[in-house]
């Protein structure tokens, strides 16, 4: 999946199976990825794992798990709230679109969290105050999470080269430059620029991740994937002047 | 091995919506000196493992990039510290604690928010 | 939670080969330096060597240079301690730990050297 | 090498009373930028050592808060405010300063 961190950084990530997203003392988030296409090294979210720890007079432990096609508006022991203790409304789901949308608001450590299904794939954003983000006792063991460090150079896909070499070869197929087997029925390139250039009209990282899905993996559905992820920034991100961002030379690496 | 606190301390110092060091500012290379500082204490404890050799050369390639010089000065992470997670043997009658932004209004001004993402493939 | 669990122990005669392996979960094996250390009987604790996360570079005390070599394979999460040319102050519990600076230890298992 | 000399090698103490091991090194072990990577730990019978403390002072992540460590240089100090049976066992002090890596002899505690 692509990832921007808590940093800004922004990378597409081939990670498989489980992976920590955040870890720190209030909250812990899982995700679990898999191949889009048999053999592809290019992966989606299916399945999303979130764990409120308990905390104070304010929230029991609570855990919400989405999986594809099942979107629930309720944590896992069917609940909608942080349970009974006196600060309880602290945390609480909404359902905004019925299996499709979830917004978790937990107020006791000021952080929002959306959860979307597009396609057959979810999504997650977050907004969280710089000092939960930091509110980690074992940096050692809890520090390494996908949202703080990225994810290990070697599981990185560099997909604006992917979209430099495609730009370059027209519609001509990509399968050498693909980090995925063709897909069944991939779009030519100036196709996969049209549908992402309609929801995506700023040519910025969120455009280019919408390219590179289309191309690899010829699912419609990843348009609105990125589409919504960036409506997600807008809506989550306390700069207002960092919400596209652009191709530049190497950045930090987020090697975990 | 305490090479994450460095990497928190240098995002710390580099984000954020007070005043933060803009990638082409003379902070942001006192932030990565700061980094580099303490990366550098370091070693002794973390230069076996993944993280101290990732920041090292994630700082090289940063100081390269920016034009920093590995002499000046250095800045100083922001950091708060927030209640304990857990359940606390002091009990408060007041709502407060369970709403994040009216605790932290008494310590200090509007908290520092930040954002990640994950989507597509 | 973090578990080692060593295993390869057992009783040799001197100048013989042992091979221990450290089978490491609850933590990302591959990201952590990781060290072997060893207790003689009723005695105390001596490092044996440390190796990086990636195998770059391998560190060793002097009473075991040129005789043992660690190594490891981050595909199976294991760290190995193949000991050769043993001697009877060999003889002690061997124990796997994690990270550069040991913070999470294996339970240990015992070497004997002994004709 | 770096010696770590502990003392006492044999600490008898009463329930509930506090307990000081002390460790010293033959060298410093502060490093040119301030830190001092001295770590202690501890050795129930039968089981494998566990980290309490490091860099002289810092608590590892679920030991409880009547373990203490204190010192800079040469001179090093953990102390129990008030002994558990628990924490019956044998204690070590180890530096990371130097190479290579070296431990204290141990002191072994028991009830008294």
């Known amino acids: 999946p692509h990832l921007r961190t808590f940093t800004d950084r922004f990378q597409t990530c081939k990670v498989q199976g489980a992976w920590p997203l955040i870890d720190n003392n209030y909250l812990n988030v899982q995700v679990t990825n898999t191949p889009v296409l048999p053999g592809s090294a290019a992966t989606a979210t299916s399945k999303l794992t979130i764990i409120f720890k308990n905390f104070q007079e304010c929230v029991d432990q609570k855990v919400y798990q989405a999986e594809m096609d099942e979107l629930p508006a309720a944590f896992v022991d069917g609940s909608k709230n942080g349970g009974d203790k006196h600060g309880a409304n602290s945390l609480k789901i909404t359902e905004k679109v019925s299996g499709q949308h979830v917004e978790i608001q937990a107020k006791y450590i000021g952080t929002t969290i959306v959860v979307r299904q597009v396609g057959r794939y979810l999504t997650f954003a977050v907004r969280m105050p710089e000092e939960v983000v930091n509110a980690v006792e074992d940096w050692d063991s809890q520090g390494l999470y996908l949202c703080l460090r990225g994810c290990p150079l070697n599981q990185q896909i560099d997909f604006q080269a992917f979209h430099t070499n495609a730009e370059g070869t027209g519609a001509r197929r990509l399968a050498a430059a693909s980090p995925a087997p063709t897909a069944p029925e991939t779009f030519p390139y100036e196709t996969a620029v049209a549908k992402c250039k309609e929801k995506l009209p700023v040519e910025d990282l969120y455009y280019q991740a919408c390219v590179f899905d289309l191309l690899t993996t010829g699912d419609v559905n990843f348009t609105l994937a990125a589409y919504y992820a960036l409506e997600d920034v807008k809506m989550l991100h306390s700069n207002k002047d960092k919400l596209h961002l652009y191709e530049r030379t190497r950045d930090l690496p987020g090697r975990a | 091995c305490k090479i994450l606190k460095c990497n928190s301390e240098f995002w710390s110092a580099t984000s954020g919506s007070h005043a933060p060091a803009s990638d082409d500012t003379p902070e942001f290379c006192a932030a990565l000196r700061s980094y580099a500082l303490c990366t550098r204490r370091t070693a002794r404890t973390c230069r076996g493992d993944l993280a101290y050799h990732s920041a090292v050369h994630g700082i090289e390639d940063l100081m390269s990039q920016h034009n920093c010089s590995k002499d000046g000065p250095t800045s100083q992470p922001r950091l708060r510290t927030l209640p304990p997670a857990g359940d606390s043997q002091e009990r408060s009658d007041s709502p407060e604690i369970c709403h994040y932004e009216k605790s932290f209004h008494k310590h200090s001004a509007t908290p520092n928010y930040t954002h990640c993402g994950l989507f597509g493939d | 939670e973090v578990q080692l669990v060593e295993s390869g122990g057992g009783l040799v005669q001197p100048g013989g080969s042992l091979r221990l392996s450290c089978a490491a979960s609850g933590f990302t094996f591959s990201n952590y330096g990781m060290n072997w250390i060893r207790q003689a009987p009723g005695k105390g604790l001596e490092w044996i060597g440390m190796?990086?996360?990636?195998?770059?570079?391998?560190h060793y005390a002097d009473s075991v240079k040129g005789r043992f070599t660690i190594s490891r394979d981050n595909s199976k999460n294991t760290l190995y301690l193949q000991m050769n040319s043993l001697r009877a102050e060999d003889t002690a519990v061997y124990y796997c730990?994690?990270?550069?600076?040991?913070?999470?230890w294996g339970q240990g298992t015992m070497v004997t050297v002994s004709s | 090498d770096v010696v770590l000399t502990q003392s006492p090698l044999s600490l008898p103490v009463t329930l509930g009373q506090p307990a000081s091991i002390s460790c010293r090194s033959s060298q410093s072990l502060e490093t040119s930028d301030g830190d001092t990577f001295l770590e202690w730990f501890q050795q129930r019978p039968g089981q494998s050592p566990r980290l309490l403390i490091y860099?002289?002072?810092s608590r590892f992540s679920g030991v409880p808060d009547r373990f203490s460590g204190s010192g800079s240089g040469t001179d090093f100090t953990l102390k129990i405010s008030r002994v558990e049976a628990e924490d019956v066992g044998v204690y070590y002090c180890?530096?990371?300063?130097?190479?290579?890596?070296?431990f204290g002899q141990g002191t072994k505690l028991e009830i008294k």
């Open positions: 860099e002289v002072s």
């Open positions: 730990a994690k990270g550069t600076t040991p913070d999470y």
């Open positions: 180890m530096q990371v300063t130097h190479d290579p890596l070296t």
């Open positions: 190796i990086y996360y990636d195998s770059s570079e391998k």
